[in-house]
């Protein structure tokens, strides 16, 4: 769920999760266009991960799962079901992805009308 996403990003990364709430074309609710930088690519990948999970019948935004933050690393589990495992992996991936990026202030509160209608395909 959203709480876990914020928690995992905060666990691994050097920045508050709030820094990604309205960033580039993909960080925040929804998203379309060409990702603007490495952070935006992380968010695009996470959108793809959530979409795959949704297609499998999971509810990414609302399903809770268990995880631990150990030495700035996300440890998933114990999972009660496959969705919890999948969603924790999605959030773990974006947390690790974002932790390796540089922050470009010019993409914070980026105007959505500048984002193209078409998006890169998911892997």
């Amino acid at each position: 769920g959203i709480l876990e996403l914020a928690g995992t990003v905060g666990c691994v990364g050097p920045r508050t999760p709030i820094a990604y709430m309205k960033y580039g074309c993909f960080c925040g609710l929804g998203g379309h266009g060409q990702p603007r930088d490495a952070i935006d690519w992380c968010c695009h990948g996470h959108d793809c991960c959530y979409t795959r999970a949704e297609e499998a019948g999971c509810s990414p935004k609302t399903e809770r799962y268990s995880w631990q933050c150990v030495n700035q690393s996300v440890l998933c589990g114990p999972a009660e079901n496959k969705c919890q495992e999948l969603l924790c992996k999605c959030d773990q991936e974006i947390a690790n992805c974002l932790a390796q990026t540089e922050y470009n202030l010019k993409y914070l509160f980026y105007p959505q009308f500048l984002c193209e209608p078409d998006s890169p395909k998911c892997d």
């Epitope: 795959r52 297609e55 999971c58 079901n81 969705c83």
Partner: antibody, heavy 118, light 107 residues
Framework: QVTLKESGPGILHPSQTLSLTCSFS??????????VGWVRQPSGKGQEWLAH???????YYNPPLKSRLTISKDPSKNQVFLTIPNVNTANTATYYC??????????WGQGTTLTVSS | DIQMNQSPSSLSASLGDTITISCHAS??????LSWYQQKPGNIPKLLIY???NLHTGVPSRFSGSGSGTGFTFTISSLQPEDIATYFC?????????FGGGTKLELK
């Protein structure tokens, strides 16, 4: 159209090994999010979940039965297998193969009946 | 394991009636409850998933509701082809577990 069909020995003697095969069509077990599971139902009783296997080869076994069950798959042949060694009369039941998603059973096979009798 | 308590175990109704079946989970299963129909000698069929979502091709007279531990399955305007056994299944926590079933008969 998704179909699943179970095949098994029908009758076994106590201490023999049960080998079940599920042959399916209409989906691939290489598809993200899909799994195949086994359920059994003794006559006049409720269903019991045995085991399932996912597209990514992750396997789940019902804990009390874990040491006695083996589930495997051959996605190229669209088949899933379940073995239970050393059966006894408590294993007499109808065994169903199912297509599953993470939270529910989407499709069931017709079932295969096993009788364990000395 | 999560226990699923389904009631009633049997039910007599007339054509055109509205019938209701309940399923109670021993712990919170959020919305992860499914309902199935099984006719004698036939394969069980998924009717409803995620508590209230109709599976493809299922008539709209079937409906489901509930969340947490209490769930309800309803058939409005009972048809002859609805005579069957109905059972619920929780999908919150493995192993999947099932209700004991409700055998629906005509009065």
């Amino acid at each position: 159209q998704v179909t699943l069909k179970e095949s098994g020995p029908g009758i076994l003697h106590p201490s023999q090994t049960l080998s079940l095969t599920c042959s399916f069509s209409g989906f691939s077990l290489n598809t993200f999010g899909l799994g195949v599971g086994w359920v059994r139902q003794p006559s006049g009783k409720g269903q019991e979940w045995l085991a399932h296997i996912w597209w990514d080869d992750d396997r789940y076994y019902n804990p009390p039965l874990k040491s006695r069950l083996t589930i495997s798959k051959d996605p190229s042949k669209n088949q899933v297998f379940l073995t239970i060694p050393n059966v006894n009369t408590a294993n007499t039941a109808t065994y169903y193969c199912t297509q599953i998603l993470p939270h529910w059973v989407a499709y069931w096979g017709q079932g295969t009946t096993l009788t364990v009798s000395s | 394991d999560i226990q699923m308590n389904q009631s009633p175990s049997s039910l007599s109704a007339s054509l055109g009636d509205t019938i209701t079946i309940s399923c109670h989970a021993s712990q919170n299963i959020n919305v992860w409850l499914s309902w199935y129909q099984q006719k004698p000698g036939n394969i069980p069929k998924l009717l409803i998933y995620k508590a209230s979502n109709l599976h493809t091709g299922v008539p709209s007279r079937f409906s489901g509701s509930g969340s947490g531990t209490g769930f309800t399955f309803t058939i409005s305007s009972l048809q002859p082809e609805d005579i069957a056994t109905y059972f619920c299944q929780q999908g919150q926590s493995y192993p999947f577990t099932f209700g004991g079933g409700t055998k629906l008969e005509l009065k």
